[in-house]
Amino acid sequence: LPAQVAFTPYAPEPGSTCRLREYYDQTAQMCCSKCSPGQHAKVFCTKTSDTVCDSCEDSTYTQLWNWVPECLSCGSRCSSDQVETQACTREQNRICTCRPGWYCALSKQEGCRLCAPLRKCRPGFGVARPGTETSDVVCKPCAPGTFSNTTSSTDICRPHQICNVVAIPGNASMDAVCTSTSPTRSMAPGAVHLPQPVSTRSQHTQPTPEPSTAPSTSFLLPMGPSPPAEGSTGD
């Protein structure tokens, strides 16, 4: 004959544990039912009565089977620099992530505690490493033969156009200007490979690297072991 199925609450056999979705209540010394996600324990079990569960109240949640007396509070509303990617429900906490153009400067278990605007590289500097959800943009000075004339968190240094005859030589923050005869070839705006040197190429004027400015946020963050990238702006 199959063993009798025990209904909660029941006293476990010596040395055995309670079943899945049950817990051992020290006071009652019985195996009792846990409450499901979205619930909490309203009345704990006794030797003769099982756990009484109640649903989580407004803006509170439980994600796991539990016997907690109160549900957990959902995190505060997402700030203006964040978007709510998961709403607060009975079974899950609210998750806030940084909106486009921002990155997570201080993360938490799920989502982001503190967002900061992505660094913008000034003219003469391009993006060396793009920003991600959790890391800032790294800027670098435009190498000879390349330029960036924008203040941007996405633009890289682009090669100067190649002129038959140069009217104004290009520099790190400005493209070469050709005379009215059209250039022999023009690099695609997004090209990253530098063309081979040619005698007609404009002379590149290397700017003196400017000190970086930190993002214009109302909080201070440790910058980490490496110095900040040059050519950034907080605009």
Epitope: S36, G38, D58
Partner: antibody, heavy 118, light 106 residues
Amino acid sequence: QVQLVQSGAELKKPGASVKVSCKASSYSFTDYNMNWVRQAPGQSLEWMGIIFPKYGTTSYAQKLQGRVTLTTDTSTSTAYMELRSLRSDDTAVYYCATDGGTWYFDVWGTGTTVTVSS
Amino acid sequence: DIQLTQSPSFLSASVGDRVTITCRASSSVTYMYWYQQKPGKAPKPWIYLTSNLASGVPSRFSGSGSGTEYTLTISSLQPEDAATYYCQQWSSNPPTFGSGTKLEIK
């Protein structure tokens, strides 16, 4: 579009039981909690209880504890509310309503009129 | 249980009027929810999380409030707004509803 279609009107004698069904369509049944709310003639709304179809767990209004049982049949996407030991003041329209895991009732059933009279 | 008291319980107003319905809670609540119900029909969700309009609700409706006092406002009453409006809370178990405000068009 999510729809909750309830069973037909019932006329019961005091002391009897009634079981009302609520069939859900066009959504994943276990993703939404099912609540039961009743409304006596000319009165406001009264919450009776909630069932979490994903887990089969329930929570009831204190006033009805012991007289009401909520169940679901996930294979047919149907929720049931059984009320026992009926009294004349149980005469009401009974609604099932989903809450989507939040704290308000976003989809309501068609309603089932239960009349308790000797 | 948290008691929700709605005022007025009955309101008669003309088309174009600005109408305000108040819901007072016996203790502080996090959010208030509102429903519209027409005779013989199930309630419809109308306003959630105090101030968000449910799908299909006209923009002339708005919700506000905090703590123990919440309001539903209709900026310019229309004939189709004639109905009974109920507030609801779930900041404390069990969830409770207000006694209702019946809105009639003069």
